[in-house]
């Protein structure tokens, strides 16, 4: 499977040549270039950057580089009518207003077109009412409020802290609880690491910093007005009332200084336990409403943002494969940012740029990959993964027949502690083998492999001597490729120490303070972590595009399927009586997993032994590997989520960022004890077990000998 066996290349054009061409200094230079002004989706600045990247990729040597444009629904604040939140007194006078913008960082005071903090796709509205503090606004937080504390959020404005789950899930939960508005804020407990200074003196969030972000619940739909189909020139668009995933209540984000002014006045119930308290000097009372002296005061939201159909631009670069040009390995990451994008996305875009440059250098020397490599700079990721999803919708027939793998390339860093990888089990062995060949950039691991430092710092919870690799969830551009189309996918970045830093994401995420200086001064001054991520992402693409036999190991899928089956069975077994009453059995699923395991084992044996010089047999075996991920797709999709079609993995219904295994069964079992019709609920559990068992069995059969 060595890359230098690939056709039409001299021995020096191997993986080593590709990796040696990657330079930290270039990544640094590209990052600087991409972060000097905002590149908000739908703006002229982001169009200009798309054209610059197109031009540079052509110079780097790609065969073709095209812009693919779509007209999608985006959301912007009203420039003359700013969004804010007030405390009003009994006469309706505004006695306190939240900030209209973040104090700009040093050196950026005169930059124009910094979009003020807002929740993208919030409807307009000016609701007023009593405040209820709902912790992280997770499903379990609303259970605690409504079931245990008997607090009714109906007609209230809720205030929730960012973190733990995707903000869109928070808004959905608040809507279902009957709230008439949502205030989101960053609590220092989640966005301020102890012992670190606030920006610009450190990488912590200052009190005036605010996290922007979309609050959609698209469930993989892409453009809210054209679900399932590309938002092209002749698209039929839904009316706004029928648009997918839009929130129905006003939502607005604030920083912790403004949040303190709201939270310090809260009365009503005390927090149920310490997990509801953040780090501000406020009581974290739940409410509803303000305490004694302030009980006549209310909170009022003023939201005037507008939804507008706007043109976006993907950049699609092609490096044609020499042997299998009809097999595509895709490296994609987004280009649009909320403001400067110092980390998200440009730390990723700079890495992609350097990977393209390295591949281009090899191509100019006469080399070509075995398979075609597609490079993508996606637009409007921040507005709901729109650019990648529209392109995949437009090209779905090609992708489902030709797509070998998708490697995602958003932020290269969210910390500088160790590697973090989320991928399909098919890529586990690829990632392990690659990281064993790469040098660790970590202090104290000089001369050691990346695999070694990664395993030491982030050990697998199941397998001794191996690193943790996580399930793919969503919240990034791999979603359509993996969850909808069933193309093997993976992502890698450098991360923080999750054990010592319990804040969510990185503190300056989606704020104006996410600048080039943040990265250069505090996260990666030598750009050695960026270089390592470039080597991992680039190395994966190189191997996937160049290995004679695809570097997928189907036995690793067998292992995780058994683990997931055990997990979902143990969840179901929390209800032994009902399982008996309704004759719920997991036998079919365990049997299918057993069959999959045996067939995968036999396939792997054949893979070692077959004649690799026979192009027909080689292509046949590779196609079985390529189409295995596809075999886990159910064309009907998951219940109420038609664009999440992968039966083994889906984004959690309670947190888009997290992956859930056997999601159909999981959701059917969730909170089943509270269902009004237990017979119907357990019937759905049985149906989901049936779908999962069938799908695993059907996938196994794609690995059987063809005749």
């Amino acid at each position: 499977k060595s890359s230098n066996e690939a056709t039409n290349i001299t021995p020096k054009h191997n993986m080593k040549a590709f990796l040696d061409e990657l330079k930290a200094e270039n990544i640094k230079k590209f990052l600087y270039n991409f972060t000097q002004i905002p590149h908000l989706a739908g703006t002229e600045q982001n169009f200009q950057l798309a054209k610059q990247i197109q031009s540079q990729w052509k110079e780097f040597g790609l065969d073709s580089v095209e812009l693919a444009h779509y007209d999608v629904l985006l959301s912007y604040p009203n420039k003359t009518h700013p969004n804010y939140i007030s405390i009003i007194n009994e006469d309706g006078n505004e006695i306190f207003n939240t900030s209209l913008f973040e104090p700009p960082p040093p050196g950026y005071e005169n930059v124009s077109d910094i979009v003020p903090p807002f929740s993208a796709f919030s409807p307009q509205g000016m609701p007023e009412g009593d405040l209820v503090y709902v912790n992280y606004a997770r499903t379990e937080d609303f259970f605690k409020l409504e079931r245990d504390m008997k607090i009714n959020c109906s007609g209230k404005i809720v205030i929730a802290r960012y973190g733990k789950v995707f903000r869109g899930n928070k808004v959905k939960n608040a809507q279902l609880a009957g709230a008439k508005g949502v205030i989101l804020y960053s609590d220092p407990a989640d966005y301020f690491a102890p012992g670190v200074k606030s920006y610009p003196d450190g990488w912590n969030l200052p009190g005036g910093g605010v996290q922007r972000g979309n609050i959609l619940n698209l469930n993989g739909a892409g453009d809210p007005l054209t679900p399932g189909y590309p938002a092209n020139e002749y698209a039929y668009r839904r009316g706004i009332a029928e648009a997918v995933g839009l929130p129905s209540i006003p939502v607005h984000p604030i920083g912790y200084y403004d949040a303190q002014k709201l939270l310090e006045k809260m009365g009503g119930s005390a927090p149920p336990d310490s997990s509801w308290r953040g780090s501000l000097k406020v009581p974290y009372n739940v409410g509803p409403g303000f305490t004694g002296n302030f009980s006549t005061q209310k909170v009022k939201m003023h939201i005037h943002s507008t939804n507008e159909v706007t043109r976006i631009y993907n950049v699609i670069g092609t490096l044609r494969g020499a042997v299998e040009p009809d097999r595509y390995v895709i490296l994609g990451g987004h280009r649009d940012s909320w403001v400067f994008g110092g980390i998200d996305p440009q730390s990723g875009a700079a890495v992609v740029h350097e990977i393209v440059r390295s591949f281009g250098t090899l191509k100019k020397e006469g080399w070509r990959p075995r398979r075609t490599i597609l490079f993508a700079s996606w637009d409007a990721e921040e507005f709901g993964l729109l650019g990648s999803t529209e392109w995949a919708e437009e090209n779905s027939r090609l992708l489902q027949e030709r797509g070998v793998a998708y490697i995602n390339a958003d932020s290269s860093i969210e910390g500088n502690y160790t590697l973090r990888v989320d991928c399909t089990p098919l890529m586990y062995s690829l990632v392990h083998n690659l990281t064993k060949e790469l040098k660790s950039p970590d202090e104290g691991f000089e001369g050691k492999s990346l695999y070694e430092s990664w395993t030491k710092k982030s050990p697998s919870p199941e397998f001794s001597g191996m690193p943790r690799i996580s399930k793919l969830g969503s919240g990034n551009d791999f979603e359509v490729f993996f969850q909808r189309l069933g193309i093997a996918s993976g992502r890698a970045r450098y991360t923080k120490n999750w054990e010592t830093n319990k804040f969510s994401g990185y503190p300056l995420y989606h704020s104006v303070y996410e600048t080039y200086e943040l990265v250069e001064k505090f996260y990666d001054p030598m750009f050695k972590y960026h270089l390592t991520v470039a080597q991992v992402r680039g190395g994966m693409v190189f191997e996937l595009a160049n290995s004679i036999v695809l570097p997928f190991d189907c036995r690793d899928y067998a292992v995780v399927l058994r683990k997931y089956a055990d997990k979902i069975y143990s969840i179901s077994m929390k209800h032994p009586q009902e399982m008996k009453t309704y004759s719920v059995s997991f036998d079919s699923l365990f049997s299918a997993v057993k069959n999959f395991t045996e067939i995968a084992s036999k396939f792997s044996e054949r893979l070692q032994d077959f004649d690799k010089s026979n192009p027909i047999v080689l292509r046949m075996m590779n196609d079985q590997l390529m189409f295995l991920e596809r075999a886990f797709i159910d064309p009907l999709g998951l219940p109420d989520r038609p664009f999440y079609r992968h039966v083994i993995y889906a984004p959690s219904s309670h947190n888009k960022y997290a992956g859930e295994s056997f999601p159909g069964i999981y959701d059917a079992l969730f909170d089943i004890e509270s269902k009004v019709d237990p017979s119907k609920a357990w019937g759905e559990v049985k149906r989901q077990i049936y779908v999962a068992a069938f799908t695993v069995q059907a996938a196994a059969e794609t690995l059987s000998e063809v005749a």
Partner: antibody, heavy 119, light 111 residues
Framework: VQLQQPGAALVRPGASVRLSCKAS????????MNWVMQRPGQGLEWIGM????????RLSQKFRDKATLTVDKSSSTVYMQLNSPTSDDSAVYYC?????????????WGQGTSVTVSS | DVVLTQAPLSLPVSLGDQASISCRSS???????????LHWYLQKPGQSPELLIY???NRFSGVPDRFSGSGSGTDFTLKIHRVEAEDLGVYFC????????FGGGTKLEIK
Amino acid sequence: VQLQQPGAALVRPGASVRLSCKASGYSFTYYWMNWVMQRPGQGLEWIGMIHPSDSETRLSQKFRDKATLTVDKSSSTVYMQLNSPTSDDSAVYYCARDGNFPYYALDYWGQGTSVTVSS
Amino acid sequence: DVVLTQAPLSLPVSLGDQASISCRSSQSLEYSNGNTYLHWYLQKPGQSPELLIYTVSNRFSGVPDRFSGSGSGTDFTLKIHRVEAEDLGVYFCSQSTHVPTFGGGTKLEIK
């Protein structure tokens, strides 16, 4: 961060006096401004604080009738009026910013205004 | 109001010695969020007070690491390892968990 206070003020007993504290170098509306009194050779005594964003005021019980705090956002200035001063009010009066999270302590102090109440 | 009692009132030291100042509170200073808002200030002769330590043990920016704070609940200590001439002045403890109050002060002076 700078907090500018006049060096001294001479006041007649009973004639109220307004002390000023002009802030610069930070986002004025985010931070409580405190007033602290120090009589000659004595310790520090907290008078009260005001939040520039909404003029919310919190006063020590002892100074409820003695001090009135106000703010002018346009000039980033906080004022403290001493009502019906007596010789007992002769002291240095400091304005000091409450550092908010993570400090919740008085992180920056003015130079103090020395008030002398004398006929 | 919370009463903060500092000891000693006066602390004569030789340069290079360690100094230790105690601050005792009339009630617990732990806030409901688990933090304790007990701070230490130094007022050098003829100057305004300056923040040294916040929330019991955190040095404010620019404060040398010879200053350290410790304690919990109602008992707190400020230690100065190897006193230097510029450390002389009056040290005040203060709390902001409840309505803010200050201790009476401890004068650090040369023996």
